[in-house]
């Protein structure tokens, strides 16, 4: 697993819709793979975390003034949709093939 | 200033190019306003931090399992360019009007 000492990476995060109270309108699936971005954005930032120039700058400033400026943060940089069966306003079960932005496709340092 | 207890927001971060070793190729300006995204992504995520669905989900999971899943992170969601004077391969001072991605325009929870 990606702890605080490991580099920014995508890790598993199974989300149960009942746990977050969304089972009241999402019928299926009961749970899904959301993934989570975990780990640190350490110097030097590798290409695989696709750093922006600002993230590179912030990393260099953090290196010089660690108490003044934080590191860049490991976050989703690309999201994927999932398919969900939900109840519409009339209570009709409806399939949404592309419920956007629900699952991490890529992580990076921002 | 935006500490750990405050909500995600854009704060000032003056970056001196000498401090980060970029003065070897950036002639001017000597420093610039990079800004930094600081503060927490607390439940409920406000509209002004433009949360993705994944960030909302992660926030809800963190609320239920705070030791298992981290909060969403306050990061730059939109960046702006700055203008820099640099030396080209022939040593000719050249102005790049739009050196992209150097300054934070907007922060959000991701």
């Amino acid at each position: 697993s990606a702890g605080a000492g490991s580099h920014c990476q995508k890790t598993s995060l199974r989300v149960n819709f009942e746990d977050i109270g969304w089972d009241s309108w999402i019928i299926a699936p009961k749970e899904y793979e959301a993934y989570e971005c975990k780990g640190g954005c350490f110097f030097p930032l590798a290409d695989d975390v696709t750093p922006t120039k600002h993230a590179i700058v912030q990393t260099l400033v953090h290196l010089k003034f660690p108490t003044k400026v934080g590191k860049a943060c490991c976050v989703p940089t690309k999201l994927s949709p999932i398919s969900v069966l939900y109840k519409d306003d009339m209570g009709v079960p409806t399939l949404k093939y592309h419920y956007e932005g629900m699952s991490v496709a890529e992580c990076g340092c921002r | 200033s935006a500490g750990a207890g405050s909500h995600c927001q854009k704060t000032s971060l003056r970056v001196n190019f000498e401090d980060i070793g970029w003065d070897s190729w950036i002639i001017a300006p000597k420093e610039y306003e990079a800004y930094e995204c600081k503060g927490g992504c607390f439940f409920p995520l406000a509209d002004d931090v433009t949360p993705t669905k994944h960030a909302i989900v992660q926030t809800l999971v963190h609320l239920k399992f705070p030791t298992k899943v981290g909060k969403a992170c306050c990061v730059p969601t939109k960046l702006s360019p700055i203008s820099v004077l640099y030396k080209d391969d022939m040593g000719v001072p050249t102005l790049k009007y739009h050196y992209e991605g150097m300054s934070v325009a907007e922060c959000g929870c991701r």
Epitope: - | I27, A28, P29, K30, E31, Y32, I82, S83, V84, L85, D88, M90, V92, P93, T94, L95
Partner: antibody, heavy 119, light 111 residues
């Protein structure tokens, strides 16, 4: 070694025309803005105009004193800069310098060529 | 157009002494935290040569005795210890706006 060599100027009558050229070597000509700067006898420097890059659609800008009479062009394949001067006036008498550089500075200069407008 | 005015028009300084030339712009030539101000040296019978750019940066091969300072509308070129080979006309120039404009020049001679 960077070199800019202007063609020979000469004597031309008022109302007449002359074309100057500038041959460049020692640098990637197509990467640089090219300028003409002139200097009347015993006077200071005056920017005449410039031509930008292919990526700028070879945009040209001119000093008010020559606008509509002078035309700057370039041929990147020949690393050459040109100045077509029409409707010449006595006050156009000057040493004309070809100067290469960036969007910020004149970095490379030719030795200059004298154009005399006189009857 | 931005008008550049140099002072003095001419200057005579003893060898080894300091020479100072001023340049004033009719409006600020600073933008984006950058000064769009350059200085050129023109020796007799020669084309101009870039001396100082961005107000305070030395051009390639320029001796350390040449320095520039200033921002906004007021700029200074300083020669810390005049040498015989520094006899020339010095021009300031702005590149903030087209048309790029020069000062009228300052003739530097040895006293």
């Amino acid at each position: 070694e960077v070199q800019l060599v202007e063609s020979r100027g000469g004597l031309v009558q008022p109302g007449g025309s002359m074309r100057l050229s500038c041959a460049a070597s020692g640098f990637t000509f197509s990467n640089y803005w090219m300028n003409w700067v002139r200097q009347a006898p015993g006077k200071g420097l005056e920017w005449v105009g410039h031509i930008r890059l292919k990526s700028d659609n070879y945009a040209t800008h001119y000093a008010e004193s020559v606008r509509g009479r002078f035309t700057i062009s370039r041929d990147d394949s020949k690393s050459s800069l040109y100045l077509q001067m029409n409707s010449l006036k006595t006050e156009d008498t000057a040493v004309y310098y070809c100067a290469g550089g960036s969007n910020y500075v004149f970095a490379f200069w030719g030795q200059g060529t004298l154009v005399t407008v006189s009857s | 157009d931005i008008v550049m005015t140099q002072s003095p028009d001419s200057l005579a300084v003893s060898l080894g002494e300091r020479a100072t030339i001023n340049c004033r712009a009719s409006e600020s030539v600073d933008n984006y935290g950058i000064s769009f101000m350059n200085w050129y040296q023109q020796k007799p019978g020669q084309p101009p040569k870039l001396l100082i750019y961005a107000a305070s940066n030395q051009g390639s091969g320029v001796p350390d005795r040449f320095s520039g300072s200033g921002s906004g509308t007021d700029f200074t070129l300083t020669i810390s210890s005049l040498q015989a080979e520094d006899v020339a006309v010095y021009y300031c120039q702005q590149s903030k706006e087209v048309p790029w404009t020069f000062g009228q020049g300052t003739k530097l001679e040895i006293k």
